[in-house]
Amino acid sequence: AGVFELQIHSFGPGPGPGAPRSPCSARLPCRLFFRVCLKPGLSEEAAESPCALGAALSARGPVYTEQPGAPAPDLPLPDGLLQVPFRDAWPGTFSFIIETWREELGDQIGGPAWSLLARVAGRRRLAAGGPWARDIQRAGAWELRFSYRARCEPPAVGTACTRLCRPRSAPSRCGPGLRPCAPLEDECEAPLVCRAGCSPEHGFCEQPGECRCLEGWTGPLCTVPVSTSSCLSPRGPSSATTGCLVPGPGPCDGNPCANGGSCSETPRSFECTCPRGFYGLRCEVSGVTCADGPCFNGGLCVGGADPDSAYICHCPPGFQGSNCEKRVDRCSLQPCRNGGLCLDLGHALRCRCRAGFAGPRCEHDLDDCAGRACANGGTCVEGGGAHRCSCALGFGGRDCRERADPCAARPCAHGGRCYAHFSGLVCACAPGYMGARCEFPVHPDGASALPAAPPGLRPGDPQRYL
């Protein structure tokens, strides 16, 4: 166990032209605070992925009001260190994100407003117990100067804080096989006490009381050899007697997530989805209020004036999660139509439309009905990049400007005669046929092929085709 400590020295305009405008003004006084997020390893992870090593928020800095006309100076900083406690071994390589936040103190409805001013990130190697490391990072026109170190909490020592130290029992020397604990020469390295019965050949521990198995061995005390054959269980072998691995323990077995968090397995470990008000690798950090600035990525915090009442983060577009910590792949929802390409600009989505299409989602076909009228009561039908008019009765042509001859297509069957009519056409059927187009033969016994002739209509009467 130990603590990562971060000391912010200055935050202000970087060198070179294009000095940023002061983030505060006489009308909108503000103050700064910082958030640090640590992840193990040299991972190049997204800013919103979990801070698996831990995170911390600074106190608020002094209130600052811009002097009119003056360039933005180095801004007043919060007092003290940012401290991120770590419970397990210090990984030696880590990634960090340091965010500079502005709290505006004007007359906003619902209390102060927070906005992210700058975010810097990096990947570093650092041994615990070493001296302060100095760093300068730039984000746009801003520059952040800071120092950091990792130190072990007694009784842990060493570059990874995994060795334990105890006061000497004898004044002159340490016990057999145990070295003095540099730099605490008056203390001796203490042997780690693993779980009782843990195999000394096949097991080891990094924390007192645990028993972790070397590859090829399993079981609570690492005494069962693993055989890779004749095992069917999804997690591997199924029976200790055959030398097969007893299924589990999976990373989520026993639910490592505290405070009602739900556990999901990841390729390398597990991930806790925490209920509102809790965060951390295992949802172990609680008592968060809006004063702690729990909403990331510009989320607005509402409620939560005291640790017992929940806060709610209202996330800006593109972010989700109870703390606005997750970026949404909004383009994966395929919002753009007609071959338009989706651009996620951060503050908004945009569809880049293909030629001939327009609209927020490329939904309008410019080659179709827009700006085109169909004459004589015709209606425009869109489709396939070319407009089409559905013409009223008696009209035809591309724009329904031509008067149609309804009899031109010879619609009356079996020798029936066609008459143009104001409402369409009428077929006068030849003897022996009936129907709107004289399509039905009249049977010799007087019955027609129709189920029944409409009342009052004799076979052979002209049929109006409507």
């Epitope: 792949d329 909004r330 383009c331 994966s332 395929q334 753009c336 071959g339 338009g340 390409l341 989706c342 651009l343 996620d344 600009l345 951060g346 989505l349 880049r352 293909r354 030629a355």
Partner: antibody
Framework: QVQLQQSGPGLVKPSQTLSLTCAIS??????????WNWIRQSPSRGLEWLGW?????????DYAVSLKSRITINPDTSKNQFSLQLNSLTPEDTAVYYC??????????????WGQGTMVTVSS | QSALTQPPSASGTPGQRVTISCSGS????????INWYQQLPGTAPKLLIY???QRPSGVPDRFSGSKSGTSASLAISGLQSEDEADYYC???????????FGTGTKVTVLT
Amino acid sequence: QVQLQQSGPGLVKPSQTLSLTCAISGDSVSSNSAVWNWIRQSPSRGLEWLGWTYYRSKYYNDYAVSLKSRITINPDTSKNQFSLQLNSLTPEDTAVYYCTRGGIVGAPDGFDIWGQGTMVTVSS
Amino acid sequence: QSALTQPPSASGTPGQRVTISCSGSNSNIGSNPINWYQQLPGTAPKLLIYSNNQRPSGVPDRFSGSKSGTSASLAISGLQSEDEADYYCAAWDDSLNGHVFGTGTKVTVLT
């Protein structure tokens, strides 16, 4: 991981047609989020985008205005590859030809994967 | 003729900060995201920055991008010898209905 493997001739005669193929592994030519490009580079013209093909419910193509009359980019779903055909070649078309993917969701213009490049010389 | 203009060369000593500019017009940089590519000698270009200021995974945070109006810039802070390469900006152009690249800037690390 995603890889693009180019194949095709290195020497083509003037007035003939250049045919290059780009085989995709680790992704799909019919992906709903990627775009598949051809780009060339020569000392005289620098980097030049030739065109792309992409799938969004159906396949679409776009070509550089200067080449529209003599370029075709075709996807081949069965072989998971896409090809470039450039007609009526002149010595001006001598360049290194690259196939690329624009595969970042929400940023199709960011060409994150590149083929190894094919040096094409147009000469009789 | 490229639609985006870059200075032909830039240089700095190790540890210095170098900035490369890219100038365009309303139809490209003014209305579309800008991307930056690094091309080491004898290799294909590599995406360095996309969507104005986003770094793909694996790109060191020494590289940062910004955009204002119709121009953009790439900054390399803490210059290192392996940064010696050609750098190109690129964007979609609404008028041409296609991608346009910058003329390229050769960065030299002075020792």
